[in-house]
């Protein structure tokens, strides 16, 4: 239904608090370097304007699109060119090209200092002084560092933050209460950020059809009792919502997401038996709960998939008549039977099925040709199962830090041209898959592992795209989204790489390492490990173990020394010499 004033419509639907939060997120994701105070001024101006449009939809400029209104606000910022360079060129364009231009300038790796969580006392003081400003800062800090973060979900995390601070700031030991709770929120939010980035990459590179296929598989796994038509409706809605958020239409995205939650709660009987608990919650929590819902029980009487898709004599006719519907039905039927598979795997199987029909339906005896298709799925299923088995075994043997190091060595050998910070970030994230997934029941491991790895590898691709340095990475990143993970897994040591020369300063450390938090210490060590592999890509596991063990002892010894600086200065060169010798 058309509205005279889109901005008035969204303000009324979302309410002032959520409206302001979403506008702040939008501005922070577009102009990532502006301070909070500058953005909040714009947010207040937009909010005041929206209120005038609510009062009178015919007021001046109220009929303008939200992109036009937001873009005009951003383009009016003084010194835009000084701070943002060529992004200012976007302002010479008309909508919708101007918004497209803004989107293209979003930076996945902005040059911002990592956000350091303040001490508990400081957080509580500032939160109690002004909760709105505190949470506004939270939205701003996260949104500018994650320009594709799913906006309505970020509002949910801000709400969680609010709950935690409200509860913990009255405790005597604020830090003991806050730290584990905020760590949990942060962990969930970081995973949400890479998952959403993957969705936007899918949308940007492969369009709505590819995303909708992903949504059909996911919904079918979650709601195996829903009819195909219901799954198609949900997938279409989810695709629209994600397209809006990825495209910067955050108000429409959040509004449509709330509408979808309402629809699902009104139609529980035809969707899933597991929704009721979610449907009793307020809007943000309801949507989040529905997005994380456990799988419904699979119907007991499902016939074999072969009946309709292999044994039926009309397979080629059905396929030819409506290819997308027939393939969608196949994906739905296969996915609802396999909550134990990753979405990536299900899409690979659907692709294999499609390729088989394309080939076989053009031949003389199609049924004989496609009759073995389900058996041909076996190697595609075994490959990720083996990946999960070997990696979880390695994780159980080495623990998270050791497993990260093993992954770091592996990926540095595959793509030694990639910058060390990017390799360390990717390996640390890939290495977390163990903690996240390997402790789950068997049936949940594969979807957890593969879909998480795919999202992390998408982040690697996005960063690599900015400054491409490795042909192998480019090749894996250019192909289909669902083939990425197998492509990276299949990479071996890059034989074309000319080893980096040994630079003593790369392995020179100072006493400042002693006071670093554990995480930062690990990153320092992992940086050294990646540099070692770049120097000696064919170093054996034992050689690397020896050098890294020696390095750990050296740091430990010097950090315990009375004169730390002197210890690092004298023992450091000895360590470098020993390392060179061990790797010779």
């Amino acid at each position: 239904e058309a509205h005279k004033s889109e901005i008035a419509h969204r303000f009324k639907d979302l309410g002032e608090q959520h409206f302001k939060g979403l506008v702040l997120i939008a501005f922070s994701q577009y102009l990532q370097k502006c301070p909070y105070e500058e953005h909040i001024k714009l947010v207040q101006e937009v909010t005041d304007f929206a209120k005038t449009c609510v009062a009178d939809e015919n007021a001046e400029n109220c009929d303008k699109s939200i992109h036009t209104l937001f873009g005009d606000k951003l383009c009016a910022i003084p010194k835009l060119r000084d701070n943002y360079g060529e992004l200012a060129d976007c302002c010479a364009k008309q909508e919708p090209e101007r918004n497209e231009c803004f989107l293209q300038h979003k930076d996945d790796n902005p040059n911002l200092p990592p956000f350091q969580r303040p001490e508990a006392e400081a957080m509580c003081t500032s939160f109690q002084e002004n909760p709105t400003s505190f949470l506004g800062h939270y939205l701003h800090e996260v949104a500018r560092r994650h320009p594709y973060f799913y906006a309505p979900e970020l509002l949910y995390y801000a709400e969680k933050y609010n709950e935690v601070l409200t509860q913990c700031c009255t405790e005597s030991d604020k830090a003991a209460c806050l730290t584990p709770k905020l760590d949990a929120v942060k962990e969930k939010a970081l995973v949400a950020a890479v998952r959403q980035r993957m969705k936007c990459s899918s949308m940007q590179r492969f369009g709505e059809r590819a995303f909708k296929a992903w949504a059909v598989a996911r919904m079918s796994q979650r709601f195996p009792n829903a009819e195909f038509a219901e799954i198609t409706k949900l997938a279409t809605d989810v695709t629209k919502i994600n397209k809006e958020c990825c495209h910067g239409d955050l108000l429409e995205c959040a509004d449509d997401r709330a509408e979808l939650a309402k629809y699902m709660c009104e139609n529980q009987a035809t969707i899933s038996s597991k929704l009721q608990a979610c449907c009793d919650k307020p809007v943000l929590q309801k949507s989040q709960c529905l997005a994380e819902i456990e799988h419904d029980n699979i119907p007991a009487d499902l016939p074999s998939i072969a009946a309709d898709f292999v044994e039926d004599k009309e397979v080629c006719k059905n396929y030819a008549e409506a290819k997308d519907v027939f393939l969608g039905t196949f994906l739905y039927e296969y996915s609802r039977r396999h909550p134990d598979y990753s979405v990536s795997l299900l899409l690979r199987l659907a692709k294999k099925y499609e390729a088989t029909l394309e080939k076989c339906c053009a031949e003389g005896d199609p049924p004989a040709c496609y009759g073995t298709v389900l058996a041909e799925f076996q190697p595609l299923v075994e490959e990720p199962k083996n990946l999960v088995k070997t990696n979880c075994e390695l994780y159980e043997k080495l623990g998270e830090y050791g497993f990260q190091n093993a992954v770091l060595v592996r990926y540095t050998q595959k793509a030694p041209q990639v910058s060390t910070p990017t390799l360390v970030e990717a390996a640390r994230n890939l290495g977390r898959v163990g903690t996240k997934c390997c402790t789950l029941p068997e049936a949940q491991r594969l979807p957890c592992v593969e879909d998480y790895l795919s999202a992390i590898l998408n982040r690697l691709c996005v960063l690599h795209e900015k400054t491409p340095v490795s042909e192998k990475v480019t090749k894996c990143c250019s192909g289909s989204l669902v083939e990425r993970r197998p492509c990276f897994s299949a990479l071996t040591v890059d034989e074309t790489y000319v080893p980096k020369e040994f630079k003593a300063e790369t392995f020179t450390f100072h006493s400042d390492i002693c006071t670093l938090p554990d995480k930062e210490k690990q990153i320092k060590k992992q940086t050294a490990l990646a540099e070692l592999v770049k120097h000696k890509p064919k170093a054996t596991e034992d050689q690397l173990k020896t050098v890294m063990g020696d390095f750990a002892q050296f740091v430990d010894k010097c950090c315990k020394a009375a004169d730390k600086d002197n210890c690092f200065a004298t023992e450091g060169p000895n360590l470098v010499a020993r390392s060179k010798e061990a790797l010779a």
Epitope: Y36, P118, E119, A122, T125, S126, E129, H137, E141
Partner: nanobody, 118 residues
Framework: EVQLLESGGGLVQPGGSLRLSCAAS????????MSWVRQAPGKGLEWVST????????YYADSVKGRFTISRDNSKNTLYLQMNSLRAEDTAVYYC???????????WGQGTLVTVSS
């Protein structure tokens, strides 16, 4: 690493004004309560003023109340102290400090010298 860099000190006549600045870096500035502390020649440290994270609450020592104004600009990560009607007894090195808890400070600047003399 955390750095606090004061500036704006100098020689001023009694009754004159000065504005001190403190540029903060190496930490997220906005959630922290910040203070000014001074040390007159040969004397101990004296707390001057404190401001809450978003600037809605300010506190002053009786000796400067009505003459000094503390403020902050979180967008610039900067703390200020506007000093008016200066007196000879305001002569001191002025330090800005990051408050960690209940008027205890975990980081200080190097200080800026203010001399009030005719």
């Amino acid at each position: 690493e955390v750095q606090l860099l004061e500036s704006g000190g100098g020689l001023v006549q009694p009754g004159g004004s000065l504005r001190l600045s403190c540029a903060a870096s190496g930490f997220t500035f906005w959630p922290y309560t910040m203070s000014w502390v001074r040390q007159a020649p040969g004397k101990g440290l004296e707390w001057v003023s404190t401001i809450s994270p978003f600037g809605s609450t300010t506190y002053y020592a009786d000796s400067v109340k009505g003459r000094f104004t503390i403020s902050r600009d979180n967008s610039k990560n900067t703390l200020y102290l506007q000093m008016n009607s200066l007196r000879a007894e305001d002569t001191a090195v002025y330090y800005c400090a990051k408050v960690v808890k209940d008027n205890t400070f975990d980081y200080w600047g190097q200080g800026t010298l203010v001399t009030v003399s005719s």
